[in-house]
């Protein structure tokens, strides 16, 4: 399996962000597919899950992603993605997306740096 | 590295009330979620419910619903459980975890005896 | 609330043995985790999601299963394994844990 990632992603305080994660796999994509999402925070803290897809698509039951993350992939077309609601700053950090799709082997984990970014105010824009 | 501390052993008489503290040091404290896992001497593993450390809010079993309560200090950085009108059945070892990838790091556990 | 039953409850093996471990839910469950304990010990997270090893877990352990049946596997036993396992679901609330499967030495 092969993993394609943005690699850095930017996003603004408060808004959604959509975590893009395609792969490629010599094996068909069937019910052996599994996705799992982790994050790890900039302050080296231990890294959370974040998503898991197998079948069905299941989000964390716990932890600062309960109810703030969705599945936006399709199998079908390679796709692995999802998206993460209502940003906050602490989110700033490296989010992995880990595809196995036996039988063939699992390959490097795709990384997204996301930064969250200061929502940008109308009074802080400066005409010249 | 992360730790939890808890503290120490307690007896108690039935019908009383049982706080256990857990300290928590070597990460951000209000990121990750505190939960209460008790084990009954020779028994399984039973999930209490848990705490998000930011805003307080919290999460409890139902079959303790009424009976736990679990809250929090920011400023120390420690988790606190308290479960009131204890009966002989809530001898147990009482364990607070944090959810990561899974409850990834645990206190030592805390030893509430419950008896007459 | 979901129940999981480990089988079997109680194992006997060998060093080098090749080893499974089931947990049967009473309704279908999204994912799983295994917890490791050794007595006085607060359990030790080995799979998460049911088929990822936690952290500074060896590659002897695996997990894997679906639905309603999960399975840990532990490829050649060492003297360090012979503990209680737990299974852990959390697709639904409250989690819950097996009753444990202890792993004794043959």
């Known amino acids: 399996v092969e993993i394609y990632t943005s690699r850095v992603l930017e996003a603004v305080n408060g808004t959604d962000a959509r975590l893009k994660c395609t792969f490629s796999s010599f094996a068909p994509v069937g019910d052996a597919l599994t996705v799992t999402w982790n994050f790890r925070p900039l302050d080296g803290g231990p890294e959370q899950f974040v998503f898991y897809y197998h079948i069905d698509p299941f989000q964390p039951m716990s932890g600062r992603f309960k109810d703030r993350v969705s599945w936006d992939g399709n199998p079908e077309r390679y796709d692995a993605s999802i998206l993460l609601w209502k940003l906050q700053f602490d989110d700033n950090g490296t989010y992995t997306c880990q595809v196995k799709n036996p039988p063939d082997v699992d390959g490097v984990i795709g990384e997204i740096r996301l930064s969250v970014v200061h929502t940008v105010r109308f009074s802080e824009i400066h005409f010249l | 590295q992360v730790q939890l501390v808890q503290s120490g052993a307690e007896v108690k008489k039935p019908g009383a009330s049982v706080k256990v503290s857990c300290k928590a040091s070597g990460y951000t404290f209000t990121n990750y979620w505190m939960h209460w896992v008790r084990q009954a001497p020779g028994q399984g593993l039973e999930w209490m419910g848990e705490?998000?450390?930011?805003?307080?809010?919290?999460d409890y079993n139902e079959k303790f619903q009424g009976r736990v309560t679990m809250t929090v200090d920011k400023s120390t950085s420690t988790a606190y459980m308290e479960l009131s009108s204890l009966r002989s059945e809530d001898t147990a070892v009482y364990y607070c975890t944090i959810y990561t990838t899974a409850l990834d790091y645990w206190g030592q556990g805390t030893l509430v005896t419950v008896s007459s | 609330d979901i129940q999981l039953t480990q089988s079997p409850s109680f194992l006997s093996a060998s060093v080098g043995d090749r080893v499974t471990i089931t947990c049967r839910a009473s309704?279908?469950?999204?994912?799983m985790y295994w917890y490791q304990q050794k007595p006085g010990k607060a359990p030790k997270p080995l799979i998460y999601v049911t088929s990822n090893l936690a952290s500074g877990v060896p590659s002897r352990f695996s997990g894997s299963g679906s639905g309603t049946e999960y399975t840990l596997t532990i490829s050649s036993l060492q003297p360090e394994d012979f503990a209680t396992y737990y299974c852990q679901q959390w697709s639904s609330n409250p989690p819950t844990f097996g009753q444990g499967t202890k792993l004794e030495i043959k």
């Open positions: 309704s279908s469950v999204g994912y």
């Open positions: 705490i998000n450390p930011t805003n307080g809010g919290t």
